[in-house]
Interface confidence: low
Amino acid sequence: SGVFQLQLQEFINERGVLASGRPCEPGCRTFFRVCLKHFQAVVSPGPCTFGTVSTPVLGTNSFAVRDDSSGGGRNPLQLPFNFTWPGTFSLIIEAWHAPGDDLRPEALPPDALISKIAIQGSLAVGQNWLLDEQTSTLTRLRYSYRVICSDNYYGDNCSRLCKKRNDHFGHYVCQPDGNLSCLPGWTGEYCQQPICLSGCHEQNGYCSKPAECLCRPGWQGRLCNECIPHNGCRHGTCSTPWQCTCDEGWGGLFCDQDLNYCTHHSPCKNGATCSNSGQRSYTCTCRPGYTGVDCEL
């Protein structure tokens, strides 16, 4: 899908005459009919297979055409098509004299034609205008033309549909060839997959938007690379989630049993020797002359 654009620039009819050579009275009130069709080696009558458009009266005899004054307030003239651009075309531009206000073909005398030009050839899709000038015995027409793709169509022949989007179904803009270009922070075939925070653990972390790192159950930390021990784990760590591997000096199911009571609490008095003997259990060996559980007597 695309648009053939024709920009009329200047029409010269110095003598103010029709194609028949008869002068216009009082001057040639000129409007144009444009016919765009498939390529023909010899441009011949027949339907305008790619489209047709007419302008209002643009001037009398010789005049320049402003950028906005044709086609009901549009110059360039627009000839839209909804098929793959074939790369070749035929173009017919007719200049007509309008004796009155009715510009319909059936309302004009057949000899109201001022001039008719026909060109054909190859034309690639692109932003650049091709400038052309056609001169006959009595008139001269200067114009330029191009083919561009319609909004959301791309590629050499405007056949690739691509609509930029930034929603649940994709986050991308369209390249000139119609391929997707992901917005920053997104990846995947249709740019639906967010790129997580750099370093976010591949298995233990995920994200629903770019530069995020959400931890799966059992993992924590900025990069989701720290496991979470089970809830009751007091003095322990883990290598996989919900474990509780006790720190040195701690034991029991929840690592809450002090295996180094002597060091942590120094219960033995008067220079006695302390020996750890299990969970919350210790034995004091008293120096001569002392007694009691903690050699306090």
């Epitope: 899908s1 839209p80 319609s150 909004d151 994709g170």
Partner: nanobody
């Protein structure tokens, strides 16, 4: 013109299940995105689940793990399987489909039109 017809709504107890269907008539290509939205009384219409190119699915956080969206391309139908329903899931559920269409005149562009169904009521009682 595309027309959508939802079905499958109704009254269900909390913890129950429902399966919504949405049949599209008209020219719907397999590359078209389809989705379910819902609107509770006094609230704005919100996204529930969607299915895109290549059958990639998306879900609102509030329904993840409970709702499943699927699609039958041959029948031009999209489904929403709703399990473990909660009272806060009560709403009118709307099916939506995105269709590309060229716009005549003007700028000769293509519009992405969202067609909506009439909606089907889902009520979850406690």
């Amino acid at each position: 013109q595309v027309q959508l017809q939802e079905s499958g709504g109704g009254l269900v107890q909390a913890g129950g299940s429902l399966r919504l269907s949405c049949a599209a008539s008209g020219n719907i290509s397999t590359g078209t995105a389809m989705g379910w939205y819902r609107q509770a009384p006094g609230k704005e219409r919100e996204f529930v689940a969607g299915i895109a190119y290549g059958a990639t699915t998306y879900y609102a956080d509030s329904v993840k793990g409970r709702f499943t969206i699927s699609r039958d391309n041959a029948k031009n139908t999209v489904y929403l399987q709703m399990n473990s329903l909660k009272p806060e899931d009560t709403a009118v559920y709307y099916c939506a489909v995105e269709v590309s269409q060229s716009t005549p005149g003007g700028r000769y562009s293509v519009a992405y039109l969202i067609y909506w169904g009439q909606g089907t009521q889902v009520t979850v009682s406690s």
